[in-house]
């Protein structure tokens, strides 16, 4: 048994944030559970991760320098994603593992979500002043 | 899915009892299996449960040094040994299949019941 | 541990009466709640599970309501095959503690 994700197939980080939801067809408020974002083709850099247990609070952390947070809601956990930049423009995969009670669950892998960095655009400032008027 | 129980003991005070679960159906290691005990007048008591893939086990604080949950992967059978009895032990007891609803839990599937006496 | 208490402990009720007991919990099981039925000397039958989805083959007047901390089983038309034991079950962390049981009997 697999779980289903579902992700909106793209996004637009205008201001360098992004809310980057995972619905689940799996509810994980009774459940110790592992969601992670994934960056990549091949998943290769893990984003961040939330990390639940229906006793305690949620732990949300990164290990490879995103700024990230995590909410959970019954059947989803979104990310939320702040300071990206335009070269982090890639797909992005949402995961998820039930670790407990057992068995051990995880998901198929889902369609991503292609997260489109757009930079800031802010007027640069002139280098010289204008010529003043008298 | 079946779960067929062992059949009905009669025991002395201070002796123990091991009542076996024999599952059919369906894969064994992949669901865990509760055990129940209803006493006569008395509502159901949950007693724990045993997942026989990782042979993870969880008790009722009230059943520890009374119960203890075993299986044999072989036969795909769990076992419930109730040990030191006292008449208070006496009761139906039920093995439960527990299935995972899309993250809700239940008991859909139940053994017949073994009845345990304890009598001097 | 999470505290079941089940009410009423017994109801006395006719064919065709709309019955209804009740489950609260000392703290909120978010859904993690399922009702089943027992006759004596039978085991239990599964009737409800996460407090409101109704098991395939069980009788469209049995229904499931509540959350947070408090849940309902109704039967809407009491018929005889009705009569007997429930009991409400949550599955919020361990020990998955049983209610108290309602004795269903005929009036």
């Known amino acids: 048994n697999k779980i289903l994700v579902k992700q909106s197939p793209m996004l637009v980080a205008y201001d360098n944030a992004v809310n980057l939801s995972c619905k689940y067809s799996y509810n994980l408020f009774s459940r110790e559970f592992r969601a992670s974002l994934h960056k990549g083709l091949d998943s290769a850099v893990e984003v961040c991760v939330v990390y639940g247990n229906y006793s305690q609070q949620l732990q949300v952390y990164s290990k490879t320098g995103f700024n990230c947070d995590g909410k959970l809601g019954n059947e989803s956990v979104t990310f939320y994603l702040q300071n990206l930049y335009v070269n982090q423009t890639d797909i992005y995969f949402c995961k998820i593992e039930v670790m407990y009670p057992p068995p051990y669950l995880d998901n198929e892998k889902s369609n991503g979500t292609i997260i489109h960095v757009k930079g800031k655009h802010l007027c640069p400032s002139p280098l010289f002043p204008g010529p003043s008027k008298p | 899915v079946q779960l067929q129980q062992s059949g009905a003991e009669l025991k002395k005070p201070g002796a123990s009892v091991k009542v076996s679960c024999k599952a059919s159906?369906?894969?064994?290691?992949?669901?865990?299996i509760h055990w129940i005990k209803l006493r006569s007048g008395q509502g159901l008591e949950w007693i724990g449960w045993f997942y026989p893939g990782s042979n993870d086990i969880q008790y009722n604080a009230q059943f520890k040094g009374k119960a203890t949950l075993t299986a044999d992967k072989s036969s795909s059978t769990v076992y419930m040994e109730l040990t030191g009895l006292t008449p208070e032990d006496s009761a139906v007891y039920f093995c439960?299949?527990?299935?995972?609803?899309?993250?809700?839990?239940?008991?859909?599937?139940w053994g017949q019941g073994t009845l345990v006496t304890v009598s001097a | 541990d999470i505290q079941m208490t089940q009410s009423p402990s017994s109801l006395s009720a006719s064919v065709g009466d709309r019955v209804t007991i009740t489950c609260k919990t000392n703290?909120?099981?978010?859904?993690?709640l399922a009702w089943y039925q027992q006759k004596d000397g039978k085991s239990p039958q599964l009737l409800i599970y996460a407090a409101t989805h109704l098991v395939e083959g069980v009788p469209s007047r049995f229904s499931g309501s509540g959350s947070g901390t408090q849940y309902s089983l109704t039967i809407s038309s009491l018929q005889p095959e009705d009569f007997g034991n429930y009991y409400c079950q949550h599955f919020w962390g361990t020990p998955n503690t049983f209610g108290g049981g309602t004795k269903l009997e005929i009036k």
């Open positions: 439960a299949r527990r299935d995972d609803f899309s993250g809700y839990d239940a008991l859909p599937y």
């Open positions: 703290e909120n099981i978010y859904s993690n």
């Open positions: 159906g369906y894969t064994f290691t992949e669901y865990i």
